[in-house]
Structures are given as C-alpha cells and as structure tokens.
C-alpha cells in the first residue's frame, strides 16, 4: 500500500486522490477511514454512501477514484484507504494520511522581564498562543534570527521606538504579533501599555502613555 501524506487547514474542502490511473475496468472501489470503516463504495455502476460521520459531506468520482470531503475538521485526522477490486479478482490499495490543522491564532506577546543593565536595556519577551504545536520566528533589529517562543535582547540607549514581530506558523497558516518598545527601559516617567491587535489594525504593541493618548485622539 502506497502512503501519501496530506496536511490541510480545518474548514477547507479536500480532494483525496491517487497520482496514478485506476486499474482498468475495476469491479469495485471502496474508500475507508482507518482499516475497515467504509465511507463510500462503488459497485455495479452505483455509489453507496455508508452511515458514517462523513455522510452528506463526501462525494466519489468513480472515474478518477477521487473522494471529495467538504469542511474537514480536526476529528477527520485519519489514514484513508482506497481499495480497488481489479477485474482479475485481486485487490489493490492506496493510503492517504490526512492531517487537519486549525489556523494558528494571533499570538500574544508578554513582557517577561525589562531592566536596566549597565545603561543598556535588557528585554525578555515571550510569544504565547494557546496549546498549539507551532514554529516561532522573531523579526526586528536582532543580531540573528530567533526561532523559539522567547526573545531576549539587550538594547543600547535609543530615542526611537523599536518593534519586534513574532510570527507563529504551522504548515497551513501563520499569524504575526508585534511589540513596539519606547524608551525609557524602566518606565519611571511614563507607563507603557499593551494595546490589542484590533485597536492597532491587527498589530499588538506596547506603547507609552503619551502614544496611547495620541492614538485614541485619532
């Protein structure tokens, strides 16, 4: 049995098919999920759809053997098997391992630590999303690309704000969160606040009280 891997985003419509031609004049074609749970069977020129969680959202194309599934969900994660009974009476099978992933949510950036160290500003940020297995990448004025959920950096004294973007991604989607930092390091003169992504057109920022006031008056 040949095994093909497919990763798709939840809610999408999926086509399960094989990359080769079906055996000529086959007698029967059946799609299963797991070993022996039937979804649909084509026999004697007719398609029979079985009572299963897929009923009403699958369609078989007997010509190509393709199985169309609408609105896949994470619960549809499975190995799908297409078995064909050939005209010589022998069975042939193909397997597709389907992984359905939810789109990643927008990340939340948390300030873990912020302190003065020898006139420089030590900053530790974490990029948080709820219970997901994802990849992280930080972008900004950094010495090297950082590929984990925590960013640690030391900033030399500066007058302008610095922004750091955390990108979270899985194989079907990616989302960004941006943190903008305005001096001073320890907010003695002005308290810095976090503004939601919605407020800032999809970006998440930490800005000064002054900026906040200005932002809300626009």
């Amino acid at each position: 049995g040949r095994l093909v891997h497919m990763t798709v985003v939840s809610g999408s419509n999926v086509t399960l098919n094989i990359s080769e031609s079906l055996p000529e004049n086959y007698k029967q074609l059946t799609w299963f999920y797991t070993f022996d749970q039937k979804i649909v069977e084509w026999d004697s020129g007719k398609s029979k759809y079985f009572e299963s969680k897929f009923k009403g959202r699958v369609r078989l194309d007997p010509q190509s053997g393709a199985l169309y599934i609408s609105k896949v969900q994470k619960e549809d994660n499975s190995t799908y098997v297409m078995r064909v009974l050939k005209k010589d009476g022998y069975e042939q099978e193909w397997k597709i391992k389907l992984q359905v992933l939810d789109p990643v949510p927008k990340p939340v950036i948390k300030i873990e630590k912020r302190e003065d160290v020898d006139d420089n500003c030590y900053l530790k940020l974490s990029c948080v999303i709820p219970g997901e297995s994802v990849n992280y990448t930080w972008y900004g004025e950094l010495p090297k690309e950082i590929q984990n959920s925590v960013l640690e950096t030391t900033l030399k004294p500066h007058k302008h704000s610095r922004c750091y973007t955390c990108q979270v991604s899985n194989s079907v989607s990616s989302k960004n969160g941006t943190f903008c930092f305005s001096p001073p390091c320890t907010a003695a003169r002005s308290e810095q606040k976090l503004i939601s992504e919605e407020d800032l057109g999809g970006e998440q920022k930490l800005i000064s009280e002054e900026d906040l006031h200005h932002h809300h008056h626009h």
Epitope: G1, F35, D36, E93
Partner: antibody, heavy 118, light 108 residues
Framework: EVQLLESGGGLVHPGGSLRLSCAAS????????MSWVRQAPGKGLEWVSL????????YYADSVKGRFTIFRDNSKNTLYLQMISLRAEDSAVYYC???????????WGQGTLVTVSS | EIVLTQSPGTLSLSPGERVTLSCRAS???????LAWYQQKPGQAPRLLIY???SRATGIPDRFSGSGSGTDFTLTISRLEPEDFAVYYC?????????FGQGTKVEIK
Amino acid sequence: EVQLLESGGGLVHPGGSLRLSCAASGFTFGGYAMSWVRQAPGKGLEWVSLISGSGGSTYYADSVKGRFTIFRDNSKNTLYLQMISLRAEDSAVYYCAKYSNYDYFDPWGQGTLVTVSS
Amino acid sequence: EIVLTQSPGTLSLSPGERVTLSCRASQSVSSSYLAWYQQKPGQAPRLLIYGASSRATGIPDRFSGSGSGTDFTLTISRLEPEDFAVYYCQQYGSSPRTFGQGTKVEIK
C-alpha cells in the same frame, strides 16, 4: 467451495513463539481481507487481527498489539499469524476467517489449538 | 468500542419450540451492521444472518433476524434437533469488530 485450513498450533511455554498458517482455496485469495479470531476454552469469540486483500494494511486487537504479526502470501494462498512473547491468556483455538467485504466473517476454518503453559 | 450483551446466557428448550435470542449494543450500531453466528461443539462458527435481517447462503428460513439501533433479535421459528448450539452476535458498524458473549440453546 471455499475452504480454510489452519495449522501450526501446539503447546508452548510462556514467552515462547508460534507461527500459525491458514491455507485457502476455492476463491481469489488476494481479493479478500482475512482475519484471525480466537476462542479460549469454554469462552466466547475474540477478534485478534485483520489484513487487507493486498496485505498493505493490518489491524490488531489491543491485547495482542506488538506481539502478534499478521501477514499473507497471495502467491501461496496462505495467511499467517506470527505470535511471540506468548502468555497463558493467549491459550485458545485460533480460527482464520474470510473477512467478507470488510464486514463479517464468512466462512471460518476448523481452527487450531494453541496452549501456553509451563 | 461497542459492547454487545446477549441474553439469556442459556436457554433450555425442546425441539419444535420457538426461540428468541437478544443482543443489545452499548451504543447504536449504524445501518444495522449486525451478524449472527451459530457454533456447535467442536466446530467453527457459521454465519447465519448479516445486515441484522439477511439470511446467509444455505441458511434455512426458520432463522430470522430483526432489530436496529441497539436492540437486535435472532428468532428460530421452530427448533430442530440440529439447532442446539451456541449463538453469537457481532457488530461491524464500527472498529474494532466485537462479539457478544454468546447464548447457549440446550435441549430441555
């Protein structure tokens, strides 16, 4: 007429191994999934393992997973069950059965007795 | 997994009597994917009924099956001497396939 004939059973010590065979005739063997079902003395039927017609997919009961291996040789019309790390609770008559259209078991062989005892 | 419970465990009857065997599933068996088997002492099981109510090839019409969802019945309209045996139900609506524990029909 479809016929299934099991062999290979016998007495084995706990931790030992056995290989059961099932010779099939009277149908296109490679077109059908096959199964092993067992029955402990005086007890009910317990499905053990399944294999697709092509041999490309296998499936096991939790009680035997990692210890039993089902395989087939379609050129010899023969089904096998390799059993290792045998336990007393594996003692049973082992039947091979044609897994009719991936639904029910029909027909069955006459069975072969496996006894695991020290 | 679906658990099948058969009742009664044993039935003591005489030839000519009508028999009703019950098989109850722990959850609904989709599309009545239920089979019945007969097993005589020292023999392999034999398929009697599939799809809850369809008789297998060569099975006499005194055997009939009915039911859906969680409750299924095997009826033998008139017991013949060769019908004394153990009867098992099996569901094939979900994986793994499971069997009931059996009902023994013995001579009174």
